[in-house]
Interface confidence: medium
């Protein structure tokens, strides 16, 4: 979908961000239609996650004047992950293996997959409101990091988790950045 | 209350130009996005775009974009749509609508509409 | 576009009675739904958002379901004053787009 929006950017302030796993998150899923991939490892002790952990970020926003009336919810995609146990990345094979190849774990990344267009509103100290659209990430996904190249290049091979269904007017493709422009 | 008040009703010759109007009382004008939506009787509803008060930004359904502009003057809390170009499918009724959405940003839908601008195309 | 369809374009019941409302989308919206009422002379009144939402004043005898593609508009006791078209709206993408509307007429 391409987005036509003309609207002009604006840089923003964003106050500190408490992050909180997505086991405490507040965002009711069923009325945001997110179905976001749960971050289960394959056993306990795993200390990589297979699919990506996917942490919730409450944070508030503001355009240097106004600040928004309630925290901005989103989710922040970070560490390292594996990639879902059908792929051939698995060491002895089999649905119940529990073991997997450490080294190439660390080719996998968890990055940005979805994100939707939100609208916010701001507060003004006059008691006026401001209304603003920003793009937020919805769903993480593991993307292997091809090591021959640069950090930031975008040479990504991508696994997608389950499809997230979104129920959001615009949808844009994420951005590495979790930085958002006002409009 | 929230009222979306517009302009009255337009008779115009084919190729000329009208701008409707929709003021804009009982809330913070700039705190919600401001909708369009034509009426007619062969096409039922359709959304020709919206404009963002604060800061002027628009979007437009495709179909529309060469057709109508959206404007906003925020020192009136009014805005406003000019249709160019104007044939006979452009006659019908127009309507501003606010876009209601929850302090999460989404469940986006027109809560509060205009009463109508009837627009007539003939020579 | 996503195009909504309303297989029917009129309805027809008596007081009382319940009747349902079917809207048809595309593609997977989600639950990005809204119903509208209009009545005759009058401008759209929005009366469920998000697909099961009611909005702000509406009395409790209208509601929505569905998710995915599938819509339902019930009301489950109809009064003589629920005489209108009913319009079904997606807000899952840009541009949003309308059902063509279903008549509801009272026997």
């Known amino acids: 979908f391409k987005n036509d929006a003309t609207e002009i950017l604006y840089s923003h302030v964003v106050k500190p961000v408490p992050a909180h796993p997505s086991s405490n998150s507040t965002l009711n899923q069923a009325r945001n239609g997110g179905r976001h991939f749960s971050s289960t490892g394959l056993d306990r002790n795993s200390r990589v996650q297979v699919g990506c952990r996917e942490l919730r970020s409450t944070k508030y926003i503001s355009d240097g004047q106004c600040t928004s009336i309630s925290p901005l919810k989103e989710l922040v995609c970070a560490g390292e992950c594996l990639p879902l146990p059908v792929l051939p990345n698995w060491i002895g094979g089999g649905y119940g293996t529990k073991y997997w190849s450490r080294r190439s774990s660390q080719e996998w990344r968890c990055v940005n997959d979805k994100t939707r267009t939100q609208r916010i509103q701001l507060q003004c100290q006059d008691g006026s409101t401001r209304t603003y659209k920003i793009t937020v990430v919805t769903a993480c996904k593991c993307k292997r990091y091809t090591r021959q190249h640069n950090e930031s290049s975008h040479n990504f091979e991508s696994v997608s988790p389950a499809k997230p269904a979104q129920h959001h007017r615009e949808r844009k493709r994420a951005s590495k950045s979790s930085k958002h422009s006002l409009s | 209350e929230v009222q979306l008040q517009q302009s009255g009703p337009e008779l115009v010759k084919p190729g000329a130009s009208v701008k409707i109007s929709c003021k804009a009382s009982g809330y913070s004008f700039t705190g919600y996005y401001m909708n369009w939506v034509k009426q007619s009787p062969e096409k039922s509803l359709e959304w020709i775009g919206e404009?963002?008060?604060?800061?002027?930004?628009?979007t437009y359904n495709q179909k529309f974009k060469a057709k109508a502009t959206l404007t906003v003057d925020k020192s009136s809390s009014t805005a406003y749509m000019q249709l160019k170009s104007l044939t006979s499918e452009d006659s019908a009724v127009y309507y501003c609508?606010?876009?209601?959405?929850?302090?999460?940003?989404?469940?986006?839908?027109?809560?509060?509409w205009g009463q109508g601008t009837s627009v007539t195309v003939s020579s | 576009d996503i195009v909504m369809t309303q297989s029917h374009k009129f309805m027809s019941t008596s007081v009382g009675d319940r009747v349902s409302i079917t809207c048809k989308a595309s593609q997977d919206v989600s639950t990005a739904v809204a119903w509208y009422q209009q009545k005759p002379g009058q401008s759209p009144k929005l009366l469920i958002y998000?697909?099961?939402y009611r909005y702000t004043g509406v009395p409790a005898r209208f509601t929505g379901s569905g998710s995915g593609t599938d819509f339902t508009f019930t009301i489950s006791s109809v009064q003589a004053e629920d005489l209108a078209v009913y319009y079904c709206q997606q807000h899952y993408s840009t541009p949003p787009t309308f059902g063509g509307g279903t008549k509801l007429e009272i026997k």
């Open positions: 609508a606010r876009l209601h959405y929850d302090y999460d940003g989404v469940g986006y839908a027109m809560d509060y």
């Open positions: 998000s697909a099961s």
């Open positions: 404009i963002n008060p604060t800061t002027g930004g628009t």
